[in-house]
């Protein structure tokens, strides 16, 4: 991964941040709840963008070269704008305009561009779509990505924190 | 991988209780929700009822909602399924399904385990 210009950082935080907020509100939990445990097994880790240690997220890795954690950050928001594009979240029960939901909407695509280089190419993902006799599937599969979601923010919240404390270059005086 | 292991189905009359239980054993900590779904002779199997494992959300088929009642016992890695108001047309075997939080686009997908099943009969 090449070295490009490093993102602005406090602006990411604070993007990152409010995220995690409406990514609260757009699905509170019932009641005591933990976010997903990321330890899967190797062959039920399938297409889901996880942020792990070989990814460069951490302090280190930042430091050297944070394009890697990026770029995974990247097809992580790329991947759950796609599922929250998808029939799961456009059909019914409907989504009020400017609801959590919508609004979450919003802020992602907006994290996403502060973080897509100009010439990154768009990956292709097929849109998942529930038949007629799948649609029981709908308020299920709409918990499950949402906490999926949940626990991909609260660790790319935690980076841009670092990255804003840390890399954020020095304000040199003008003359 | 999940191991399920279902039991509490019997004959009953029409209008009487059962209580299924799931007990699940394995890497229970990948899994997202914990479902009930039940086939009848010559017929597709169905989705009844499910509860996410660690939020506790419940959701029901239209056809049992306000009869059936899902619930969980996560420090003896159960889930309960409690049947009341039964009906002949709930006559069916039910099946334990747990589903892994790993598969975002589909729920009780290929990447689900399900248990051996356990007969309901409801007579007239």
């Known amino acids: 991964v090449p070295r490009s210009s490093s993102p602005d950082w406090a602006q990411c935080q604070q993007l990152s941040r409010n995220l995690c907020m409406l990514a609260w509100n757009a699905h509170a939990p019932a009641g005591h709840m933990n976010l997903l445990r990321e330890e899967e097994d190797e062959e039920t880790k399938n297409n889901v963008p996880r942020i792990q240690c070989e990814d460069g997220c951490d302090p280190q890795g930042l430091k050297d070269n944070s394009q890697f954690c990026l770029q995974r950050i990247r097809q992580g928001l790329a991947f759950y704008k796609h599922l929250l594009d998808s029939d799961i979240f456009k059909g019914e029960p409907a989504l009020l305009p400017d609801s959590p939901m919508e609004q979450l909407h919003t802020s992602l695509l907006g994290l996403s561009q502060l973080l897509q280089p100009e010439d990154h190419p768009r990956e292709t993902q097929q849109m998942p779509s529930l038949s007629s006799s799948q649609q029981w599937q709908r308020p299920l599969l709409r918990s499950k990505i949402l906490r999926s979601l949940q626990a991909f923010l609260a660790i790319a919240a935690r980076v841009f924190a670092h990255g804003a404390a840390t890399l954020t270059e020095p304000l040199v005086p003008t003359a | 991988e999940v191991q399920l292991v279902e039991s509490g189905g019997g004959l009953v009359q029409a209008g009487g209780s059962l209580r299924l239980s799931c007990a699940a054993s394995g890497r229970t900590f990948s899994v997202y929700a914990m479902g009930w779904f039940r086939q009848a002779p010559g017929k597709e199997r169905e989705f009844v009822a499910a509860?996410?494992?660690?939020?506790?959300?419940?959701y029901y088929a239209n056809s049992v909602k306000g009869r059936f009642t899902i619930s969980r016992d996560n420090a003896k890695n159960t889930v309960y399924l409690q049947m009341s108001g039964l009906k002949p047309e709930d006559t069916a075997v039910y099946y334990c399904a747990a589903d892994p939080s790993s598969d975002l686009v589909t729920v009780f997908g290929d990447s689900a385990s399900w248990g051996q099943g356990t007969q309901v009969t409801v007579s007239s």
């Open positions: 509860i996410t494992w660690s939020g506790g959300e419940t």
